[in-house]
């Protein structure tokens, strides 16, 4: 299982750091169902 380290805001996932609980300011659509940016 992945080791979660949210003190740093990062999760260790298969030896790779990825920011999971992302800032709502992220334009990548990390929040399920939240409309982000304009439709391209």
């Amino acid at each position: 299982d992945a080791e979660f380290r949210h003190d740093s805001g990062y999760e260790v996932h298969h030896q790779k750091l990825v920011f999971f609980a992302e800032d709502v300011g992220s334009n990548k659509g990390a929040i399920i169902g939240l409309m982000v940016g304009g439709v391209v």
């Epitope: 709502v24 659509g29 399920i32």
Partner: antibody, heavy 112, light 111 residues
């Protein structure tokens, strides 16, 4: 009209695999993460994982790590989820989600 | 896994009256960055789910302001100030502090 259109219902035997598609219509699927969730009959929602179509990076819930494989074909604006080694417990409606758009859901029934 | 527990599981409501749903997480969803990673979704009958509230108290686009959400790090409440017929369905709380997990759902129906 902007929408995500999923492939139709599937009936599979235990042990088989199934590949569900999610096509962006009026929507560039490359721009945002594509999430996949499932809803068991008369039950709640489970998050399977997500893929970043830009680079193919995936994150899975541990229980789906060996069950689901997420891919994207950016040339056709289509995301895919393949489920392997199907069991009756995998009978569910599967949803794709990207930005504020949800697919209509695909019912996968596993039965012998 | 962070476990999300909702109550009640069924909530008969009267149109025009207020209603509330509770959700508890097995771990605090308040991150050191000040954000609380708690979400509310509604699944209307025969439809895909939709996002209502994100990061505990932010209303998603197009959601009527009769919906509101509040809470601490582990205890949360979704409130509907005046229930309308279109509000029926199953409400789910969810967290994404550590991946995503959902509550078991609360069915809201008209009395």
């Amino acid at each position: 009209q902007v929408q995500l259109v999923q492939s139709g219902a599937e009936v599979k035997e235990p042990g088989a695999s199934v590949k569900v598609s999610c096509k962006g219509s009026g929507f560039n699927i490359k721009t945002y993460y594509v999430h996949w969730l499932r809803q068991l009959p008369e039950k709640g929602l489970e998050w399977i994982g997500r893929i970043d179509p830009e680079n193919g990076e995936t994150i899975y819930t541990p229980k789906f790590q060996d069950k689901a494989t997420l891919t994207v074909d950016t040339s056709t604006d289509t995301a895919y989820m393949e489920l392997s080694s199907l069991r009756s417990e995998d009978t569910a409606v599967y949803y794709c989600v990207s930005s504020g758009y949800w697919g209509q859901g695909t019912l996968v029934t596993v039965s012998s | 896994d962070i476990v999300m527990t909702q109550s009640p599981l069924s909530n008969p409501v009267t149109p025009g009256e207020p209603a509330s749903i509770s959700c508890r997480s097995s771990k605090s969803l308040l991150h050191r960055n000040g954000k609380t990673y708690l979400y509310w979704y509604l699944q209307k009958p025969g439809q895909s789910p939709q996002l209502l509230i994100y990061q505990m108290d932010h209303l998603a686009s197009g959601v009527p302001d009769r919906f509101s959400s509040s809470g601490s790090g582990t205890d949360f409440t979704l409130k509907i100030s005046r229930v309308e017929a279109e509000d029926v369905g199953v409400y789910y709380c969810a967290q994404n502090l550590e991946l995503w997990t959902f509550g078991q759902g609360t069915k809201v129906e008209i009395k």
